[in-house]
Structure formats: structure tokens, C-alpha cells
């Protein structure tokens, strides 16, 4: 009779994490008598995975009934596979011996590869806000995937970015891997509604990549532009001065009126109007009683936006051009901001 051979028909098996791996093994003969053992790896450091005769192997089940006299199928199933189970598995036939069984024949080995999905990419931006024309960095991280091959792309509003650096760790071998990428993005004034997207493609995702997003509204600060204008009022001794605060983001803004350098009124932007690009406009006005002034008045609109140093715009009010009203000593009326959208 021909000598027993141990057949492992599958050179490799690919299993998704969490699933069950089937490792096939058959013997070509019932002789010699003796048990089968499964090992991961070879040589003196090999690891026993299953022993037909003794031991407790809770994750391993046999495909067929090994207690049947004429059984020659020694295939096993390993449940709840993790990336740590990857390796080459050998089905080894032992010959009955005294006192110990003797290794007789080994199969050629089956390489078990484990696929694990990457975690959802997490995109994070800079800690502090930045203004248009500045370059900011965004990071994207995803973990726990196997095999190591992975593709990462960056997009801004659907347009692919090219200025980024990506690392997959560790450099050497591991049961699973992580990816870390940093992209540089140049901010524009129109970026309040913009999104930065990190897209990760991996063999486990069946062509449906995972995406992580960051809204540039969390990152950008658009400083306001100021315009101070003077409008005539029906009452001859009064002038209405408006300060138009345009195209700012975020909304946090405080405005102070100064008359000849002295604080006249401070207010916080409340009812603002939103532009299509996500920035805000706001207008504040000041009613100045020119008859209270002997000399020309320097009116200053000073704006502190989002905790940044104040910016200001001044307007010189010529008193000599207006008739004086006797007995009035009020410099300016404490009027609120104009809530109408002037655009």
C-alpha cells in the first residue's frame, strides 16, 4: 500500500476578522494508526492549535467526526478569527508510539491571512482659528486594519488635494495597522461652508471607502471689513453715522463707538444677516447731535472680532457745516443698532 500523505489542498485562506476559518486536511491512508495535530508555524517554536487526542481547544471544531474508524478528514474550523491568528498552519500526522507518539508526516501548510476593516477615519483640524490666505493642517487617522495596503485621499469640496503626507504604522509586521495623514489646506474667504474630507479605501471595504470630514467653519476666521458713512437726518442739528461691518465669521463680535477717542457706546452683534458664503453682516448706527459740539468730531467705529485685536474705522464730522441749536448739550443719543439688511 502507498505510504500515507497529508494533503492540505489550500495553500492560502483569506478570512475576515470575526468570521470562522476552515483549514482543510485529509490523509490518504488509515495507516499508520495515530492522531492528527494542528500547529501554527513550524520548528521548535511552533504552537499547538489542536490535538485530536487530548487538550481543550475552545475555538476549534472538527469538520467531520474524528472518532469514526475510517475517517480521513482532519479539517478544522477556528472561530472568531482576529488578525493575531494569521500565520501558516500545518496538519501533522503522528504515528502511535510508546511512550510518546512520533511525528510521521506533515501537510504542506496553509497560510491564513486575516482581513480587518479600518476604523472610521477621524479628521481633526488646528486648535486655533486661522484667517484666509493662511495654510492650516488637518490630520486623519484610521486604525485596526489588515492587510497593510491602504489608500488615503484628501478632498476639499470634492476637489482632490495633493499637499499631504501619509504614514502607515508600524513599518514592520503587525497583526493590524494604523494610518495617519496630514494635509495642508490654504484658506479662502469663501471657506465658511467648505468641508475637508479624508477618504480611506481598503480591500475589506468592497470599493465603498470610509470618509471622515471636518467643517472649515470650525477652523476659519474671516475678519470684517468696516465702512463708516454719514447720512443726513431730518432734524438739522442731527447726523446719523453708520458703521457697516461686512463679511465676518464667526459671529462673535463687539462694536464700540468712540467720539474724539471717548467711549460713547458698546454693543454686541446680535441680529446679524447671513451672506450666501456663510459670513455675516451687521450695521450699527449713531445719532450725533452736532449742536453739542463746538469743534469737528472724530467718530470711530471700533470692532473686536472673535477675541482678536480691535480694528477701527474713523469718520470726521465737520461741525462748522451744521447750524447750532441753542440749549442742547447731548452729544449722542444711545440708539441701538439698525437691524435692517442694507444689502
Amino acid at each position: 500500500e502507498e505510504e500515507l500523505q497529508v494533503i492540505q489542498p489550500d495553500k492560502s485562506v483569506l478570512v475576515a476578522a470575526g468570521e470562522t476559518a476552515t483549514l482543510r486536511c485529509t490523509a490518504t491512508s488509515l495507516i499508520p494508526v495515530g492522531p492528527i495535530q494542528w500547529f501554527r508555524g513550524a520548528g521548535p517554536g511552533r504552537e499547538l492549535i489542536y490535538n485530536q487526542k487530548e487538550g481543550h481547544f475552545p475555538r476549534v471544531t472538527t469538520v467531520s467526526d474524528l472518532t469514526k474508524r475510517n475517517n480521513m478528514d482532519f479539517s478544522i474550523r477556528i472561530g472568531n478569527i482576529t488578525p493575531a491568528d494569521a500565520g501558516t498552519y500545518y496538519c501533522v500526522k503522528f504515528r502511535k508510539g510508546s511512550p510518546d507518539n512520533v511525528e510521521f508526516k506533515s501537510g504542506a501548510g496553509t497560510e491564513l491571512s486575516v482581513r480587518a476593516k479600518p476604523s472610521a477615519p477621524v479628521v481633526s483640524g488646528p486648535a486655533a482659528r486661522a484667517t484666509p490666505q493662511h495654510t492650516v493642517s488637518f490630520t486623519c487617522e484610521s486604525h485596526g486594519f489588515s492587510p497593510r495596503d491602504i489608500t488615503l485621499k484628501w478632498f476639499k469640496n470634492g476637489n482632490e488635494l495633493s499637499d499631504f503626507q501619509t504614514n502607515v504604522d508600524p513599518v514592520g509586521e503587525s497583526v493590524s495597522y494604523s494610518i495617519h495623514s496630514t494635509a495642508k489646506v490654504v484658506l479662502t474667504r469663501e471657506d465658511v461652508h467648505s468641508q475637508v474630507i479624508c477618504e480611506v479605501a481598503h480591500v475589506t471595504l468592497q470599493g465603498d471607502p470610509l470618509r471622515g470630514t471636518a467643517n472649515l467653519s470650525e477652523t476659519i476666521r474671516v475678519p470684517p471689513t468696516l465702512e463708516v458713512t454719514q447720512q443726513p437726518v431730518r432734524a438739522e442739528n442731527q447726523v446719523n453715522v453708520t458703521c457697516q461691518v461686512r463679511k465676518f465669521y464667526p459671529q462673535r463680535l463687539q462694536l464700540t463707538w468712540l467720539e474724539n477717542g471717548n467711549v460713547s457706546r458698546t454693543e454686541t452683534a446680535s441680529t446679524v444677516t447671513e451672506n450666501k458664503d456663510g459670513t455675516y453682516n451687521w450695521m450699527s448706527w449713531l445719532l450725533v447731535n452736532v449742536s453739542a459740539h463746538r469743534d469737528d468730531v472724530k467718530l470711530t467705529c471700533q470692532v473686536e472680532h472673535d477675541g482678536q485685536p480691535a480694528v477701527s474705522k474713523s469718520h470726521d464730522l465737520k461741525v462748522s457745516a451744521h447750524p447750532k441749536e441753542q440749549g442742547s448739550n447731548t452729544a449722542a443719543e444711545n440708539t441701538g443698532s439698525n437691524e435692517r439688511n442694507i444689502y
Partner: antibody, heavy 122, light 112 residues
Framework: QVQLQESGPGLVKPSETLSLTCTVS????????WSWIRQPPGKGLEWIGF???????FYQSSLKSRVTISLDTSKNQFSLKMTSVTAADTAVYYC????????????????WGQGTTVTVSS | DIVMTQSPLSLPVTPGEPASISCRSS???????????LDWYLQRPGQSPQLLIY???SRASGVPDRFSGSGSGTDFTLKISRVEAEDVGVFYC?????????FGQGTKVEIK
């Protein structure tokens, strides 16, 4: 193809610890044994020990109390630490890859580093 | 430990002529699976050893076919069918059946 590169100090003082690192490039650490072998000046080869990719270690019994071999798969490196060195530990130290395809034995030390000379002297 | 003994320890050779090195192990290197755990190495002057033969008779990748290994159990032979100048160096046999791995003392091959 796979290449091995030893690194570490060339001179170690008696009673101190010898530390060497071997960097594996161009290949997989999985399914192989990673060995340290030394050769004293003008003498033959002496196996120090090896580590399997699963972390299991095997040492020369006469050196076991002084030797530790460790593996860092994340960096594709393995290391040798030998404590309490004496002049008798002066040798060329080789790192090497040992194959294992099936069964209990091994299938030849098929890749060797170029070797690093370690002198134990005060 | 398995003791490996080589002979001769020195072998003067003539280029183009055959050469033979013997290696004996203190216990059988033939495993129950039928595999022989005996390897041959060549260490050229100033170089690292290189694997020539594994499993008693299988040539390693890139090794010229003038090198052949034979033997079983405890007695093994490395043959060079036609020695070339580049074959000078020290030849070692080694066993890989069990730890510790052990090597022979080496056979120094030099041109006559």
C-alpha cells in the same frame, strides 16, 4: 531580497552588557526564526540562540543565564542582550534567518548579516 | 547536545579536480518524517557564511550544481565535482534537528 544588518557598539567593557540589533529589510518576519551566531577570532561558529516570529525563544544552555533575544516586529528588528561579558565573548556576531517549513526541525540558516566585531576590553 | 565532527580539517585542492568533505553527527539527524536536518555552509575569507545545502541534499538558491550533499542518519558527505578558485574558504556542516543548533569545527579548503 532579504537583507540583515547588525548594529551596536564594537567595544564593550568587561562585566558590562553587550547590546546588538539586527534590522531586517526586504522581507517578512513571519514564519522564520531569527538567530544570533558568533565566531571568536580564528575559531568556528557558535549558535547563541534564536527567536521565532511568535516570540518563543531558544538559547544555548551555557549562555542562557546571560542572554536575552527579543523581537520588535513593528520595526522589523530583533536584538541580542548579553550581560556580564568577559574577554571570552570577543567575537564577530552574526544575525541570521533560519527557515522552518514543516515538522519539528529547521531548514537551514539561509540569510546572514555581514557580521559585527565586538571586542570585550577595558 | 548533538556533536558534529568534520574531516578532514584541512583540504588542499586542485582547481578542476573533485573534493569531498565528511561530517558525522553524534545522533541520527533523520527525523521520523523522513527528513534529514543537516546543512552545509561555506564561509569565504572575510565573508559571512552562506547556505549551500539543506535537508542533507537540497541545494540552496543560487548554489552551483557542482556542490552536492548526500548521506543519512549520522554520516554525511559534501562533494564538489570540480573545484573552482572561488570555492576556497571554510566549509561547515550543521544540524538543525534540535536546539542548540550545532556546527562542525570546519574544513579549510585551499588551493594547492
Amino acid at each position: 531580497q532579504v537583507q540583515l544588518q547588525e548594529s551596536g557598539p564594537g567595544l564593550v567593557k568587561p562585566s558590562e552588557t553587550l547590546s546588538l540589533t539586527c534590522t531586517v529589510s526586504g522581507g517578512s518576519i513571519r514564519d522564520y526564526y531569527w538567530s544570533w551566531i558568533r565566531q571568536p577570532p580564528g575559531k568556528g561558529l557558535e549558535w547563541i540562540g534564536f527567536i521565532y516570529y511568535n516570540g518563543r525563544t531558544f538559547y544555548q544552555s551555557s549562555l542562557k543565564s546571560r542572554v536575552t533575544i527579543s523581537l520588535d516586529t513593528s520595526k522589523n528588528q530583533f536584538s541580542l542582550k548579553m550581560t556580564s561579558v568577559t574577554a571570552a565573548d570577543t567575537a564577530v556576531y552574526y544575525c541570521a534567518r533560519v527557515r522552518a517549513y514543516s515538522g519539528i526541525g529547521l531548514d537551514g540558516t539561509d540569510v546572514w548579516g555581514q557580521g559585527t566585531t565586538v571586542t570585550v576590553s577595558s | 547536545d548533538i556533536v558534529m565532527t568534520q574531516s578532514p580539517l584541512s583540504l588542499p585542492v586542485t582547481p578542476g579536480e573533485p573534493a569531498s568533505i565528511s561530517c558525522r553527527s553524534s545522533q541520527s539527524l533523520l527525523y521520523s518524517t523522513g527528513y534529514t536536518y543537516l546543512d552545509w555552509y561555506l564561509q569565504r575569507p572575510g565573508q559571512s557564511p552562506q547556505l549551500l545545502i539543506y535537508g542533507g541534499s537540497s541545494r540552496a538558491s543560487g548554489v552551483p550544481d557542482r556542490f552536492s550533499g548526500s548521506g543519512s542518519g549520522t554520516d554525511f558527505t559534501l562533494k564538489i565535482s570540480r573545484v573552482e578558485a572561488e570555492d576556497v574558504g571554510v566549509f561547515y556542516c550543521g544540524q538543525a534537528l534540535q536546539t542548540p543548533l550545532t556546527f562542525g569545527q570546519g574544513t579549510k579548503v585551499e588551493i594547492k
